[in-house]
């Protein structure tokens, strides 16, 4: 903590300017008023301060504002942005895309997906819901960001914006966020043509459930096999090997690459052999022939 | 064949929460997005929300702070709890299944339970 | 939300007769409607869906038609099993939408 000294008359200061860079921490701290760092913060980002000067001012700014920034604030970080934490950022009410834009510029570069992440949440808050406008600014200046959303906060996002999700935005998305994200598409893009459709739903496919997948299979969409290794395990071994080989076309030949990946491994362990062996690709853990298949989980649930 | 049923108290007071099960047989749930919908007596059909198998849910928002959908797949059902219910939420109560295919792409009901009376009242 | 208004409330036909139904849509729904019937103390059967698909078991005597927002429901020869309230429901948009039913009776 930097600690309290009294202003020398000559070093007062009565606006940010460059001159402020000859200062000690101490002489910051001391000369600097609060209140006239908040309102000229559009200035200190083009001064050339020390990480050490930034976090005299982030600690000048923190006293003034213990319940969180104002937007006016926030909005004029800078690179002072880089010296907030995600607890900070938690306090702030941001609505400004303007604000999101500047504040992902600066931490472009920096190991800051905490912070980012927090901040894109605080903006969701904020607005209210994952609108259009904050999906493209996403999109354009933090790419993989929506995926740092949690599912509750995805939610938000009304069908009609699904359309300016781009497939790389949802590379780094796991099973509970697509979970959220799949039948928003499906609503989406309900309206277009099989091969149109599958092009638009295939980035949210991991949150699919098996009875959409089977319907796939009789559209001869023939899935790629990274595609086919995200979608849920449970959605995956409910499916014959028919409707796998109908699924993925000519793709079938991948499965013998993925033989001991999941969901692969444990849908071989599902089929009889006998089926595997109709596809010619030598996989292998299939059920043997004259065994009997008890699916307990089943009987359980009728019990 | 796949058949669902709906269990709960059909007498609740005002205030307080009105909780439903519904339990699917003969299938499972995973595969299938799974809702409920209310009609109040001599009235219209109204849609609360659906849940997948993984617990992901979305509710009407007329609704919405007071609703919780949650499931049990190790159980193979899935619940509903309306907090501070009125007169205004006495209706049959059903359990419905989204047809859930993209071949015919859409989300509507293909599968109802019988439906349960709840009745709310002090 | 897409407010969905049946018309009539209530519609008297003689059995053999011809029943038309209809179900317009606050905006476009394009062709994301279903049709239901529902009998006294049953739950609502899917009848129609995408307009004019029937479902699974469904008689060739009920034909779905219209699209954007206009629908209607036709029963081209009414059998005695048919009297029951008819219900539109779209799904182009959450929260999904259920018209306030349509009674039809025995003239």
């Known amino acids: 903590d930097v600690e309290r000294t009294t202003c020398p008359p000559e070093k007062e200061v009565h606006e940010i300017d460059e001159s402020l860079i000859f200062y000690k921490k101490r002489e910051l701290e001391a000369c600097v008023d609060a209140a006239l760092l908040a309102a000229q913060m559009d200035r200190v980002d083009a001064i050339p301060f020390t990480y050490e000067q930034l976090d005299v001012l982030k600690h000048k700014l923190d006293e003034l504002y213990p319940q969180g920034y104002p937007e006016s604030v926030i909005r004029h970080l800078g690179h002072l942005f880089l010296k907030m934490s995600p607890e900070d950022i938690r306090k702030w009410n941001v609505t400004s895309l303007e604000t999101l834009k500047a504040l992902l510029k600066v931490s472009k570069g920096h190991e800051m997906s905490a912070q980012v992440a927090t901040l894109i949440d605080r903006v969701v808050v904020g607005r209210g819901q994952l609108d259009k406008d904050t999906v493209d600014t996403l999109t354009a200046f933090c790419p993989g960001c929506l995926c740092s959303l949690s599912p509750e906060r995805l939610s938000s996002v009304p069908p009609s914006v699904i359309g300016a999700v781009r497939p790389q935005d949802l590379d780094t998305c796991g099973p509970r966020q697509l979970d959220v994200l799949y039948p928003k598409a499906r609503l989406a893009f309900q309206n277009m043509s099989g091969s149109e459709y599958f092009v638009k739903i295939r980035p949210f496919l991991g949150g699919a459930p098996t009875e959409d997948v089977k319907a796939l299979s009789q559209q001869n969409v023939s899935m790629d096999l990274a595609t086919f290794m995200k979608l849920r395990r449970e959605a995956v071994l409910p499916l014959t090997v028919a409707e796998v080989q109908k699924l993925l076309g000519p793709h079938v030949e991948g499965l013998k690459v993925e033989e001991q990946h999941s969901p692969v491994r444990d849908w071989i362990l599902k089929q009889r052999q006998d089926d595997l062996d109709t596809l010619g690709l030598g996989l292998q853990g299939g059920i043997p022939n004259g065994y009997l298949i008890l699916d307990l989980s089943v009987r359980e649930a009728l019990s | 064949q796949v058949q669902l049923q709906e269990s709960g108290p059909g007498l609740v007071k005002p205030s307080e929460t009105l909780s439903l099960t519904c339990t699917v047989s003969?299938?499972?749930?995973?595969?299938?997005?799974w809702s409920w919908v209310r009609q109040p007596p001599g009235k219209g059909l109204e849609w609360i929300g659906y849940?997948?198998?993984?617990?992901?849910?979305n509710s009407n928002p007329s609704l919405k702070s007071r609703v919780i959908i949650s499931v049990d797949t190790s159980k193979n059902q899935f619940s509903l709890k309306l907090s501070s219910v009125t007169a205004a939420d006495t209706a049959v109560y059903y359990c419905?299944?989204?047809?859930?295919?993209?071949?015919?792409?859409?989300?509507?009901?293909?599968?109802w339970g019988r439906g349960t009376l709840v009745t709310v009242s002090s | 939300e897409i407010v969905m208004t049946q018309s009539p409330a209530t519609l008297s036909v003689s059995p053999g007769e011809r029943a038309t139904l209809s179900c317009r849509a606050s905006q476009s729904v394009q062709s994301n409607l279903a049709w239901y019937q529902q009998k006294p103390g049953q739950a609502p059967r899917l009848l129609i869906y995408g307009a004019s698909t029937r479902a699974t078991g469904i008689p060739a005597r009920f034909s779905g038609s219209g699209s954007g927002t206009e629908f209607t429901l036709t029963i081209s020869s009414l059998q005695s099993e048919d009297f029951a309230v008819y219900y539109c429901q779209q799904y182009n948009n959450w929260p999904l939408t259920f018209g306030q039913g349509t009674r039809l009776e025995i003239k």
């Open positions: 849940i997948f198998y993984s617990g992901s849910t």
């Open positions: 419905a299944r989204e047809v859930g295919r993209i071949a015919v792409a859409g989300w509507f009901f293909d599968l």
């Open positions: 003969g299938g499972s749930i995973n595969n299938y997005y």
